[in-house]
Each structure stands twice: as structure tokens, then as C-alpha cells.
């Protein structure tokens, strides 16, 4: 389970590397961060490393209510402040690693840790 | 109503330290970003730098950074800028400014503080 | 770091006058622009957020607009107490946070 982590946490971290370049990993971390109510990897300061976004900017993903821009020049009360690795892996380890078996090539660095059937799945539960 | 009340300014040495401290009240002093800003006799606003709401996030000025340290005290609502290694150039009034952020601009200003360096 | 540039730098108008003072953008800000007034010796007081929107408080003769990289602050009739300088001030990408260079309104 902690290799399962330590590879959820450096492919996300990896994921928001790619974030303002590909508009795919854009829209899947951002299902993610608003879905599971978190921003960043361990939290949302994170997002201030990423070098090519804006250091007083999150994704919009990352508001409490979002709307276009809610992300630019943000305020922490606005903002979800908790990491998604924890709170994803948390929901992992509770929802699926308990029901699946996970190969190691599924945790390849390219490779979705986390399927799209089982985000619509947090979602609707 | 809401004040910002600045402290700490005075005259000192090149080199000399200072801490500024500013008293919040009136307001919710965690819901807001905080800045210092200065203005040097007859010249325009420099922001200095600010700090996030919780502390977690602190960027300064080129002109002041490995020099000077903000930070807060949410307990007390009080904000603080640590001076060290002044020069003859950080001379100037400072000012506690909070920030609402987002697209809100900086809407309350303290009176300021002086800081006079010469030697 | 976005540079933000005003114009004029100092201004000679009279009571009853309508002013308008620039503000550019070295780069797109959208409409995260912020205008504030400061007299002498006193703090500097915000007056317009949002390039448009107006401060509670704020006489309606100030109004400001533009998106992007060109703004202004208009003062539709001015009245004695508008003497003083304003700032442009950007808050779309920071640190720094990035004023204007002041323009000084003077009585003609």
C-alpha cells in the first residue's frame, strides 16, 4: 500500500507538472480536485511550484464554489486548502485497492492511477 | 470599525534592524492576505510584500528579499515586517494593507509608519 | 513581472473639468486592475477594483474601464477635494504586485 501511494503521489505530482501544457491532464486533474474537494498533491501550495502557472493562482478546480477565474489571485477561504494525495488515497484504499488487485504496470508514470469508472463512481456516491 | 494601527518605525544606522508591527481590528483578520507596502519621500507605492492568510505563503520584493520577514500572529490579529541590513534606500513610509484578493483590490490602508535609515 | 505605466505623469485641471487618466499593461491583466486616490501625507484610499466597480463609499463621478492591457480612470466633474495623485495597481499575476507610476492632479 505505500508503494501504491508513493506512486499515486508522484504521478499526480507529475500530472500537475503537465497541467497547463495538455488540456486532457487539465480536465483530469481538475474532475479530481473538485470531486474529491482538495487542491494540489500534499496540499494547495503545491500548485505555487508549477513553474510555468502564475505563483497567486490554483486551477479553478481548487474553489469552494467554482466559477470561471476563482483561481486567479485567490484567497484561502476560498479555496479547498487539502492535498489530493492523501484524500484520494485515503478513498483508494478504502474503495478500491480493498476490491482490486493492482498490477505494477498499472502504476506506470503515464498510467491513470485512478480509472475513470471510479471517479464517476465517488461521484455519485 | 476596521483599523489597521502601524508601529515601529523610527530612525536607524545602515545596517541596523527594525521589526513594524501592525494591530488589526474590526474585521476578521484570518479572511484576508495582508501586505506591506512603502512609499520613499516623493516617490510612488512599492509593494513589499505580503502573506497569505494562514502564513503558509510569503513572497517578497526583489529589492528586500533575504532582508526582510513578514509574518502574523492570527491569535493577536497583528501583522509583522522583521527589517535587518537596512539601507538608505528602504527608507520610506510603510504601510499595513489588507487584501481581500481574488478581484477585490487592497480596500484598507493603515496611516503608516516611518522608517528613517542615515547614519 | 508585469510593468504598469501611466499617463500623463501630472495633470492641470480645473473645478468642473472631466479627466482622464491611462493606465497601461506591459502584458494582458483581463480586468484585475485596481485605481486608488492618495493626498498628501495621508494613505492611499482604493477607489476603483475590477477596472470598473466601484468602492463602497466612492463618489459616482469616478469611473473606470478597459480589460486587458488599456485602462482608465475617469473623473466625470471634478471637485476640489480630486486633487491628489492616483495609482493604477495590477493583482492579475503576483508576486510583485505592480503599481503604475502615479499621475499628480493639479489645480489650473
Known amino acids: 500500500r505505500d508503494k501504491v501511494m508513493s506512486e499515486f503521489n508522484n504521478n499526480f505530482r507529475q500530472q500537475m507538472e503537465n497541467y497547463p501544457k495538455n488540456n486532457h491532464t487539465a480536465s483530469i486533474l481538475d474532475r479530481m480536485q473538485a470531486d474529491f474537494k482538495c487542491c494540489g498533491a500534499a496540499n494547495y501550495t503545491d500548485w505555487e511550484k508549477i513553474p510555468s502557472m502564475s505563483k497567486n493562482r490554483v486551477p479553478d478546480s481548487c474553489c469552494i464554489n467554482v466559477t470561471v477565474g476563482c483561481g486567479i489571485n485567490f484567497n484561502e477561504k476560498a479555496i479547498h486548502k487539502e492535498g489530493c494525495v492523501e484524500k484520494i488515497g485515503g478513498w483508494l484504499r478504502k474503495n478500491v485497492l480493498e476490491q482490486k488487485l493492482i498490477s505494477e504496470e498499472d502504476l506506470g508514470g503515464e498510467q491513470k492511477l485512478i480509472s475513470e469508472e471510479d471517479l464517476h463512481h465517488h461521484h455519485h456516491h | 470599525q476596521v483599523q489597521l494601527v502601524e508601529s515601529g518605525g523610527g530612525l536607524v544606522k545602515p545596517g541596523g534592524s527594525l521589526r513594524l508591527s501592525c494591530a488589526t481590528s474590526g474585521f476578521t483578520f484570518t479572511d484576508y492576505f495582508m501586505n506591506w507596502i512603502r512609499q520613499a519621500p516623493g516617490k510612488g507605492l512599492e509593494w513589499v510584500s505580503y502573506i497569505s492568510n494562514s502564513g503558509s505563503i510569503r513572497y517578497y520584493a526583489d529589492s528586500v528579499r533575504g532582508r526582510f520577514s513578514i509574518s502574523r500572529d492570527n491569535a493577536k490579529n497583528s501583522l509583522y515586517l522583521q527589517m535587518s541590513s537596512l539601507r538608505a534606500d528602504d527608507t520610506a513610509v510603510y504601510y499595513c494593507?489588507?487584501?481581500?484578493?481574488?478581484?477585490?483590490?487592497?480596500?484598507?490602508w493603515g496611516q503608516g509608519t516611518t522608517v528613517t535609515v542615515s547614519s | 513581472d508585469i510593468q504598469m505605466t501611466q499617463s500623463p505623469s501630472s495633470l492641470s485641471a480645473s473645478v468642473g473639468d472631466r479627466v482622464t487618466i491611462t493606465c497601461r499593461a506591459s502584458q494582458s491583466i483581463s480586468s484585475y486592475l485596481n485605481w486608488y486616490q492618495q493626498k498628501p501625507g495621508k494613505a492611499p484610499k482604493l477607489l476603483i477594483y475590477?477596472?470598473?466597480s466601484l468602492q463602497s463609499g466612492v463618489p459616482s463621478r469616478f469611473s473606470g474601464s478597459g480589460s486587458g492591457t488599456d485602462f482608465t480612470l475617469t473623473i466625470s466633474s471634478l471637485q476640489p477635494e480630486d486633487f491628489a495623485t492616483y495609482y493604477c495597481q495590477q493583482s492579475y499575476s503576483t508576486p510583485p504586485i505592480t503599481f503604475g507610476q502615479g499621475t499628480r492632479l493639479e489645480i489650473k
Open positions: 475590477a477596472a470598473s
Open positions: 494593507v489588507r487584501d481581500p484578493r481574488q478581484i477585490y483590490g487592497m480596500d484598507v
